[in-house]
Amino acid sequence: GWVWNQFFVPEEMNTTSHHVGRLRSDLDNGNNSFQYKLLGAGAGSTFIIDERTGDIYAIEKLDREERSLYILRAQVIDITTGRAVEPESEFVIKVSDINDNEPKFLDEPYEAIVPEMSPEGTLVIQVTASDADDPSSGNNARLLYSLLQGQPYFSVEPTTGVIRISSKMDRELQDEYWVIIQAKDMIGQPGALSGTTSVLIKLSDVNDNKPIFKESLYRLTVSESAPTGTSIGTIMAYDNDIGENAEMDYSIEEDDSQTFDIITNHETQEGIVILKKKVNFEHQNHYGIRAKVKNHHVDEQLMKYHTEASTTFIKIQVEDVDEP
């Protein structure tokens, strides 16, 4: 019968040829009366056989990632009779893996949005690299992820590629971060190949800033002839947040005379001081009122940032009009 061994040939060999192994019949007594033949896809072009000895050689460079095994057929003939000594038999030559492929991030570009002030450990995004080498061949395709850029705000789990927050970030200081992740095969051992990817992490706004008046004192004037509903001036607060988190409502906190009102212009985020009751210079020529400003939308969980509303003082001078 045939004497079989497992046949392996390393991929990407840089020698002209490589001895793969030997086909042998146990009837072969070594007197050179047998002729071995190789048939099938790759016979004669990728693999050749020494017909006298049955030695098989790979005669071209192989790429396991292109083709990982060859199914060939073996024959052995008695030269003296021309007859087959053994039944034709199929056998396999496996191409063994070398670490010739670097990890690649196939889902680039990566982009993630995470709320500012998120706590440590918050999951941002998972990046995944793939390696074309054989996962069952040692550590050739076993990857380890590491952070090349992004400390101290981010960390990456070495085996999963999960990026997490490792330090709170304030959008009002910096609103986006570029994180660079490296994937190394061979679980990072010497001789490892690596690939990198960039992740753009944008911070979404949370309402962690209350509106604050630009001025602690506003001076306005109103003519005693002004009808009710007259706009007598504007006041303005600023809020470092953006979008709806910066929307604000102005209101009167203190006006004993109940002469004025404040309405909010939601387009400009200004407070408009309105005359609610007519004024009389001869009766009272100046008023002092206090206004306050609050965000329009405040999340319950963020109330700690909004405990005390910002206030400002408005001094209003009444202008005299000559009366007949």
């Epitope: 840089n14 020698t15 002209t16 990728t46 056989i49 020494d50 017909e51 005669i59």
Partner: antibody, heavy 121, light 107 residues
Framework: EVQLLESGGGLVQPGGSLRLSCAAS????????MNWVRQAPGKGLEWVST????????YYADSVKGRFTISSDNSKSTLYLQMNSLRAADTAVYHC??????????????WGQGTTVTVSS | EIVMTQSPVTLSLSLGERATLSCRAS??????LAWFQQKPGQAPRLLIY???TRATGIPARVSGSGSGTEFTLTISSLQSEDFAVYYC?????????FGGGTKVEIK
């Protein structure tokens, strides 16, 4: 008896082309690798190119890569070397040589007498 | 590429003497080395392949040895037909490369 007979050499101007042939007999041509080796006047041997049996794989010396093309015709048992953009440094006797068996597949066990290529203006 | 260095360049010996030719490879080529003989006006002739296997028809006085980077061709007793130029050649890596040759001449 294995025999190799080269032809196609001659005098050519720099930048010109030539096609060398090597007619083989006495063996199963498609089962062996074939080589071209050259020898400049008074110099040593220099490998030029190799083709595997059946023509699946070809290899070239850096000095001729992109200019020379090796090929074979199994039906005619003939090896060829197409030489383009010839230079004075290509002047030599060009030998074809048959590959061996097994581990000596990319060897040179039988040589032809050679054909002379002269590149000169 | 693998550089093959032969020494000596010329060897002057008498009939019946022992000739020892050396060939060194710039890196290991295992046993994938061949030796050729060339006489003036003739094609090279294969003597040895696989570092030590004699080609068909080569007399027993011609022998090869070595592996890795150091190789030797020995002709135990020089005959008149042995005076020629000898080349070593590696076939382990592309490009295939030859040594510069050793001329064995009559003293």
């Amino acid at each position: 008896e294995v025999q190799l007979l080269e032809s196609g050499g001659g005098l050519v101007q720099p930048g010109g082309s030539l096609r060398l042939s090597c007619a083989a007999s006495g063996f199963t041509f498609s089962s062996y690798a074939m080589n071209w080796v050259r020898q400049a006047p008074g110099k040593g041997l220099e490998w030029v190119s190799t083709i595997s049996g059946g023509g699946a794989n070809t290899y070239y010396a850096d000095s001729v890569k992109g200019r020379f093309t090796i090929s074979s015709d199994n039906s005619k048992s003939t090896l060829y070397l197409q030489m383009n953009s010839l230079r004075a440094a290509d002047t030599a006797v060009y030998h074809c040589a048959k590959g061996g068996m097994g581990g000596y597949y990319y060897g040179m066990d039988v040589w032809g007498q050679g054909t002379t290529v002269t590149v000169s203006s | 590429e693998i550089v093959m260095t032969q020494s000596p360049v010329t060897l002057s010996l008498s009939l019946g003497e022992r000739a020892t030719l050396s060939c060194r490879a710039s890196q290991s080529i295992s046993s994938n080395l061949a030796w050729f003989q060339q006489k003036p006006g003739q094609a090279p002739r294969l003597l040895i392949y696989g570092a030590f296997t004699r080609a068909t028809g080569i007399p027993a006085r011609v022998s090869g040895s070595g592996s890795g980077t150091e190789f030797t061709l020995t002709i135990s007793s020089l005959q008149s037909e042995d005076f020629a130029v000898y080349y070593c050649q590696q076939y382990n890596y592309w490009p295939l490369t030859f040594g510069g040759g050793t001329k064995v001449e009559i003293k």
